[in-house]
């Protein structure tokens, strides 16, 4: 009679994580008598996966009833596959012996490959806000995928970015892999509503890539522009001066009025108006009693935006020349106004 052969018909089996893997094994003869065992790997360090004779293998079931007479099907199923299960599995026939069974013949092995989906990409931006024209870095990370082949793309508002670097780790063989990418993005004043998107495509996703997003509103700081103007006279001796704070983001802003360098009033931006581009405008006004001043008054609107050094704009209010004409539009020009930036 021809000597028993152990046949593992499948050279390789591909299974998605979470599914069940079926590993086929058939013997060509019932002789010699003895059990079948399944191992992952070969040599002395091999791992026992299933023993027909004894032991508890909760994830393993046999495809057929091994207690049936004349059964030569020793195929097994391994449930709830994870990337850690990848490897080469050997079906090994043992010959009944005393005191121990003796290894008789092994199959050629079946390589189990596990496909695992990448985790949802996580995009993170810089720790501190940056202003327009500056370049900022965004990182994207995704983990736990297999096989190693993966594609990552970056987009800003739907436009693909080209300035990025990507690494897939580890470089060698592994049960699963991670991807890390860093993209450089140049900010513009219109980026409050912008989004940066990291898109990951992998064989397990069947053409439906995963996306991670970051809102540039978390990253950008648009500094305000200031304009101080003198309004028409309210009463005989009062002048209304306004400070227009325009196009700033985020909203956190504190304004201080100074009269000849002395703090007159401090307030926090509250009822702001929002522009289409997501930036804000705000206006503060100061009522100056001209009769209380003998000399010209230097009014300064000083703004501290988002914890940054204050910026200011000044307006010189002439009180000696023509007090009656102060409210006229001609006299309300920003005579002698200047801008002071304090850094």
């Amino acid at each position: 009679e021809e000597e028993l052969q152990v046949i593992q018909p499948d050279k390789s089996v591909l299974v998605a994580a979470g599914e069940t893997a079926t590993l086929r094994c058939t013997a060509t003869s019932l002789i010699p008598v003895g059990p079948i065992q399944w191992f992952r790997g070969a040599g002395p360090g091999r791992e026992l996966i299933y023993n027909q004779k004894e032991g508890h293998f909760p994830r393993v079931t046999t495809v057929s009833d091994l207690t049936k007479r004349n059964n030569m099907d020793f195929s097994i199923r391994i449930g709830n596959i994870t990337p850690a299960d990848a490897g080469t599995y050997y079906c090994v026939k043992f010959r009944k012996g005393s005191p121990d069974d003796v290894e008789f013949k092994s199959g050629a092995g079946t390589e189990l490959s596990v496909r695992a989906k990448p985790s949802a990409p996580v995009v993170s931006g810089p720790a501190a806000r940056a202003t327009p024209q500056h370049t900022v870095s965004f990182t994207c990370e995704s983990h736990g995928f297999s096989p190693r082949d993966i594609t990552l793309k970056w987009f800003k508002n739907g436009n693909e970015l080209s300035d990025f670097q990507t690494n897939v780790d580890p470089v060698g063989e592994s049960v699963s892999y991670s991807i890390h990418s860093t993209a450089k993005v140049v900010l513009t004043r219109e980026d409050v509503h912008s989004q940066v998107i990291c898109e990951v495509a992998h064989v397990t996703l069947q053409g439906d890539p995963l996306r991670g997003t970051a809102n540039l509103s978390e990253t950008i700081r648009v500094p305000p522009t200031l304009e101080v103007t003198q309004q028409p006279v309210r009463a005989e001796n009062q002048v209304n001066v306004t400070c227009q704070v325009r196009k700033f983001y985020p909203q956190r802003l504190q304004l201080t009025w100074l009269e000849n360098g002395n703090v007159s009033r401090t307030e926090t931006a509250s009822t702001v108006t929002e522009n289409k581009d997501g930036t804000y405008n705000w206006m503060s006004w100061l009522l100056v009693n001209v009769s209380a001043h003998r000399d010209d008054v230097k009014l300064t609107c000083q703004v501290e935006h988002d914890g940054q050094p204050a910026v200011s704009k000044s307006h010189d209010l002439k009180v000696s020349a023509h007090p009656k004409e102060q409210g006229s539009n001609t006299a309300a020009e920003n005579t002698g106004s200047n801008e002071r930036n304090i850094y």
Epitope: K11, S12, V13, L14, T22, S64, D73, S75
Partner: antibody
Amino acid sequence: QVQLVQSGAEVKKPGASVKVSCKASGYTFTGYYIFWMRQAPGQGLEWMGWINPNSGGTDYAQKFQGRVTMTMDTSISTAYMELSRLRSDDTAVYYCAREDCTSISCSFDYWGQGTLVTVSS
Amino acid sequence: DIVMTQSPLSLPVTPGEPASISCRSSQSLLHSNGYNYLDWYLQKPGQSPQLLIYLGSNRASGVPDRFSGSGSGTDFTLKISRVEAEDVGVYCCMQALQTPRTFGQGTKVEIK
């Protein structure tokens, strides 16, 4: 000589089931796996699963799990493939094939003539 | 799954002339044992599919020697040295390396 003879064409309504038979002759039925494949119009062949007539063991492609059942009757050397909850995209020619294995490789050395299953309301 | 891509999908041939069909796989079919796990099948009009070539280049029993398979890794070719009228039908490649087995779309060979 080795032959695999399949049952005739079927027309089914969506939601129904179909059972295709594959009668083997000319060899020891229990000595070879029977695989089932299908080919939809204008498409390539698609692997559905197998049955081992020696043990009754089966394995189904993930796509068909829960809808397909492969059985056999060794007394008449026949394998069966039943597909339930039929949809219009199950319209295809269904084939059985014998898998022949050496210690190195396995191939489908004999095929049935195919059974056309049309799913239409 | 391994994706198999055949070209051309249609091949008009002249009897007596050579013909060749290409099959590409999305990953290598070369096993560490040195064998390429690729089969070629032919389905003649009105007939069951039949095995022509296994392990990339081995002719199945009863297959005429005008059929030959070559290639390795991801690129494979089936050649017919001199086409005969009886060779018409749909030729299909299949990767036999990995379960699930996957097939090419098929190449229809017909006489001009």
